[in-house]
């Protein structure tokens, strides 16, 4: 019973974690404009792994994709790769773990096979979680480095006169989502590995004995009756994220001049 609970909980935790990794990867707010100790601007800049966005005080938001591969920093490419590897491993892990669940009976799958699948999915979840944590941490490190570099260069200009105030970026919501999601996936993986130990059949000194009754041939094996249950999931994944640090309360996307009515 404890094994089933541990395995089930590990699966659910990993599922939430992987959903979080996917959400973090898709989010636009990996880095957001630093508003502290900065000249207050009427625009708010934020960037993701795939595009950068600008929100004006009018609420009008414009996002531009990074339509180049070669022109992007190697670190950003590495982060993208880590997150995608994390998602792929996590997705495969989920697929494997569904079949490994003790509460689901698929054909005449042996417990040893389920144990192996549970261990495999557990390892996949652990690696997936580590990939996500590594990806987010690399990006965070990149941000910290750039933050201090831009702080040092912030008030430099031609002839000592301030020409441009550099936009500094700080941690966005996606980083925190990624760290938490990676952690959950890792924990889920560890739980699956723990459950695997309980699933592995112990060696017994006797073999299955067949008792022949007249006219019938019924085989009895040691071990209790395993109930077969259908395990359905109706989880809706909605990507919901806010505009980050706003200087205004709630602003919606701006309509065209003629939409004012």
């Amino acid at each position: 019973m404890a094994v089933t609970a541990c395995q089930g909980l590990g699966f659910v935790v990993s599922l939430i974690g992987i959903a979080g990794i996917i959400a973090a990867t898709c989010m636009d707010q990996w880095s957001t404009q630093d508003l502290y100790n900065n000249p207050v601007t009427a625009v708010f800049n934020y960037q993701g792994l795939w595009r950068s966005c600008v929100r004006e005080s009018s609420g009008f938001t414009e996002c531009r994709g990074y339509f180049t591969l070669l022109g992007l920093p190697a670190m950003l490419q590495a982060v993208r790769a880590l997150m995608i590897v994390g998602i792929v491993l996590g997705a495969i892990g989920l697929l494997v773990s569904i079949f490994a669940l003790k509460c689901i009976r698929i054909g005449s799958m042996e417990d040893s096979a389920k144990a192996n699948m549970t261990l495999t999915s557990g390892i996949m979840f652990i690696v997936s979680g580590l990939c996500a944590i590594a990806g987010v941490s690399v990006f965070a490190n990149m941000l910290v480095t750039n933050f201090w570099m831009s702080t040092a260069n912030m008030y430099t200009g031609m002839g000592g006169m301030v020409q441009t105030v550099q936009t500094r970026y700080t941690f966005g919501a996606a980083l925190f989502v990624g760290w938490v999601a990676g952690g959950l996936t890792l924990i889920g993986g560890v739980m699956m590995c723990i459950a695997c130990r309980g699933l592995a059949p112990e060696e017994t000194n006797y073999k299955a004995v067949s008792y022949h009754a007249s006219g019938h041939s019924v085989a009895y094996k040691p071990g209790g009756f395993k109930a077969s249950t259908g395990f359905g999931s109706n989880t809706k994944n909605k990507k919901i994220y806010d505009g980050g640090a706003r200087t205004e309360d709630e602003v919606q996307s701006y309509p065209s001049k003629h939409d004012y009515v």
């Epitope: 105030v165 004012y260 009515v261």
Partner: antibody, heavy 118, light 113 residues
């Protein structure tokens, strides 16, 4: 279409206060920041500040922080600007304008002429 | 605060003439995030509120005649009227829409020769 109604003129005594109104229609009042701009006779334009009608959060030009107070009444889609301790320097036309693309002002009220005179 | 310097302060023109006026800001109005310059041009006639002509330094507002063109980037901006009409006689203001507090130039007055 977008309309911003402002009273034509206000005559006030030095040292007194005046509350100017700006009634908005033709757009979702609570969705867009509303700005106030001052223009002295024959002079240029000066940005006073802005208010977000939804939450009431404000951002003032340092120069007008002690002079102007911005408020809104969501139920009537009206923005207000109270000017205190009036002097002859405050005699001007005051405009209200909601923010537009590029943080610009596409729509303006007709302006309220405030005359400070004994 | 950002200082907006407009020149010349006044221009005497004749109908059909090409006119150029300048606006300089004390700091760059270019936002690196979208490569847009947050500078706006307004036209104001006596007794009227300002009218939006150009935003994002070069985007013409709908309904504004195409003889009005905005250009420039960073700190230097220009408003060009390709062929001045009688109804264009007014004061033209540039505005910093990037940094708070928003600031306006002192204006360029277009007068009839």
């Amino acid at each position: 279409q977008v309309q911003l109604q402002q009273p034509g003129a206000e005559l006030v005594k030095p040292g007194a206060s005046v509350k100017l109104s700006c009634k908005a229609s033709g757009y979702t009042f609570t969705s867009y920041l509303l700005h106030w701009v001052k223009q002295r006779p024959g002079q240029g334009l000066e940005w006073i500040g802005m208010i977000h009608p939804n939450g009431g959060s404000t951002n003032y030009n340092e120069k007008f922080k002690t002079k102007a107070t911005l408020t809104v009444d969501k139920s009537s889609s009206t923005a207000y600007m109270q000017l205190s301790s009036l002097t002859s320097e405050d005699s001007a036309v005051y405009y209200c304008a909601p923010v537009y693309f590029g943080n610009s002002f596409a729509y303006w009220g007709q302006g309220t002429l405030v005359t400070v005179s004994a | 605060d950002i200082v907006m310097t407009q020149s010349p302060s006044s221009l005497t023109v004749t109908a059909g003439e090409k006119v150029t006026m300048s606006c300089k800001s004390s700091q760059s109005l270019l936002n690196s995030g979208n490569q847009k310059n947050y500078l706006t041009w307004y036209q104001q006639k006596p007794g009227q509120p300002p009218k939006l002509l150009i935003y994002w330094a070069s985007t013409r507002e709908s309904g504004v005649p195409d003889r009005f063109t905005g250009s420039g980037s960073g700190t230097d901006f220009t408003l060009t009227i390709s062929s001045v009409q009688a109804e264009d006689l007014a004061v033209y203001y540039c505005q910093n829409d990037y940094y708070y507090p928003f600031t306006f130039g002192s204006g360029t007055k277009l007068e009839k020769k």
